[in-house]
Amino acid sequence: YNNFRKSMDSIGKKQYQVQHGSCSYTFLLPEMDNCRSSSSPYVSNAVQRDAPLEYDDSVQRLQVLENIMENNTQWLMKLENYIQDNMKKEMVEIQQNAVQNQTAVMIEIGTNLLNQTAEQTRKLTDVEAQVLNQTTRLELQLLEHSLSTNKLEKQILDQTSEINKLQDKNSFLEKKVLAMEDKHIIQLQSIKEEKDQLQVLVSKQNSIIEELEKKIVTATVNNSVLQKQQHDLMETVNNLLTMMSTSNSAKDPTVAKEEQISFRDCAEVFKSGHTTNGIYTLTFPNSTEEIKAYCDMEAGGGGWTIIQRREDGSVDFQRTWKEYKVGFGNPSGEYWLGNEFVSQLTNQQRYVLKIHLKDWEGNEAYSLYEHFYLSSEELNYRIHLKGLTGTAGKISSISQPGNDFSTKDGDNDKCICKCSQMLTGGWWFDACGPSNLNGMYYPQRQNTNKFNGIKWYYWKGSGYSLKATTMMIRPADF
């Protein structure tokens, strides 16, 4: 150290100035009443920590150092006073005893003074060493604080640049949002325009619908009139027939009015003037028992009684013997008309059977048998077919001669197995044979390699399950 000064400032604080190189450190230390005892827990050679101390810790440590410095200062002052006091006392003694043994006394005093001076010098050196040690430590701490401050400044700068970046990004996003808002507004406008156009269209359609409704009302009225007229005509015809039957005694006088308007099949319905496709009520031959059937009045001249239809897999065809006997399903959708009705009907007169098929690739085909009938239940509704024509194969996919009908609970096939169990559905199975239009319904892309599907072998092969099938009958003389 180049310089070490001690002075008092205007408010009574002791001032210590340390000159180190080009730097000058000034410490302002407050006055303390009590002096730290020599047993104070100060260790001059304590190892310092590497990392900078926390701020609060540093402040406390500085206060401790200030206290120690203050104590040292007071101690030095006391030491000075003590030396001065001793010097005064000894000067008085010298003056009093000047005459007596001056030489001896002077030597003794000189020795005393030298010893004391040496002692004081040693103590001062020790104190100075302590002060320097503490000053060094303070300097290192200041250096650590300086480093910490630099680090914090760097972090602040980094954060500032990050904030600036975020602000830039924010402004970019704000611009984007604004642009999107503009776009959204434009889109909303175009949507509003479209909505307006649609509203115009809807109002136009509403007016058209109103007109159509009016027309429907008119048509309904006309229809009602026509129906009334038809009813009147029927009544007139019936009256005439009654008159005829009563006038002719050879004829049966009890001809029921109902008998004249009941139909055995769709051919009769067609011939009576009903030429629209739909569900009609048919009557069993020689019976009052009725059954609902779908009539196809358009295909191939009309008059077809639909006895089977598959189209969407909505109806389960794995049914009992009784269900196949009486029929099941919905005549407007998938259904089986019933073996008993078909057997009775086809044994009254000669019927043709047409089987219409659709595959999943949009192709259609048919098989037409010029003579078809079913045996009675006693003979297991055995199928009889003759004269095959059509596009669904040159060979009949219903085995010839015909087989008995089989169901899951009525096994009449020629297989060791139960074909109905194996292939599902009731059918005229052989062993098990080339067809089963009552098999499992498989949707598109699941319809190949299905041996229990809707099969018509001589059109699509073994494992192909068809999309739609219709079996229909009509009198051969229609």
């Epitope: 169990q421 044979g433 390699n449 041996f451 072998y457 699509k460 073994s462």
Partner: antibody, heavy 121, light 107 residues
Framework: QVQLVQSGAEVKKPGASVKVSCKAS????????MVWVRQAPGQGLEWMGY????????GYNQKFEGRVTMTTDTSTSTAYMELRSLRSDDTAVYYC??????????????WGQGTLVTVSS | DIQMTQSPSSVSASVGDRVTITCKAS??????VAWYQQKPGKAPKLLIY???TRDTGVPSRFSGSGSGTDFTLTISSLQPEDFATYYC?????????FGGGTKVEIK
């Protein structure tokens, strides 16, 4: 008597194709479906697919779909099975067999003697 | 695909012994099960179809039984020519599948 005679053994490199033939005799070739079954060395039987000689209809095991083609030549009563993109695990004995029914792929009552196909680089 | 699990995988027996091989299907296959016999280096031979019907020329010592998921092939009195591997086969559902086989060996 009813007989199925297959072509001889083949050695193929990975990635190659093999076409095995099966000549039928002693019955009406178009009246029965023909199936192909393979057996890897020391392993069980694996059904590959079938062909209906009457109409050329086929059905393949999904495992071989896209790699196998089954065909027939009714004039010579011969069935063929072609397997493409051969791998080492295709090394097996390939059998043709007749189904007992034309209309369904039931059980197999007559078998060929088998054709060993070895796939090795 | 329907799994056919055969057991045992091998059985050691003597001539005259009664041998029973079982096959379990992973789902109901009705009675659509066949049994085949295969000798080393030879093609399989049909023994039984529809679970219990013997094919033409198959000796009566071979019998099959079962329905649904559990099937059995029984050789009532093992003969020297019966030492072979036996396979069960379901044809109820596509694709047809086989059991892993049961090897009948001489004790």
């Amino acid at each position: 008597q009813v007989q199925l005679v297959q072509s001889g053994a083949e050695v193929k490199k990975p990635g190659a194709s093999v076409k095995v033939s099966c000549k039928a005799s002693g019955y009406s070739f178009t009246d029965y479906n023909m199936v192909w079954v393979r057996q890897a060395p020391g392993q069980g039987l694996e059904w590959m697919g079938y062909i209906d000689p009457y109409n050329g209809g086929t059905g393949y095991n999904q495992k071989f779909e896209g790699r196998v083609t089954m065909t027939t030549d009714t004039s010579t009563s011969t069935a063929y099975m072609e397997l493409r993109s051969l791998r080492s695990d295709d090394t097996a004995v390939y059998y043709c067999a007749r189904t007992r029914d034309r209309y369904d792929v039931w059980y197999f009552d007559v078998w060929g003697q088998g054709t060993l196909v070895t796939v090795s680089s | 695909d329907i799994q056919m699990t055969q057991s045992p995988s091998s059985v050691s027996a003597s001539v005259g012994d009664r041998v029973t091989i079982t096959c379990k299907a992973s789902q109901d296959v009705y009675i659509a099960v066949a049994w085949y016999q295969q000798k080393p280096g030879k093609a399989p031979k049909l023994l039984i179809y529809w679970a219990s019907t013997r094919d033409t020329g198959v000796p009566s010592r071979f019998s099959g039984s079962g329905s649904g998921t559990d099937f059995t092939l029984t050789i009532s009195s093992l003969q020297p020519e019966d030492f072979a591997t036996y396979y069960c086969h379901q044809y109820s559902s596509y694709p047809p599948t086989f059991g892993g086989g049961t090897k009948v060996e001489i004790k």
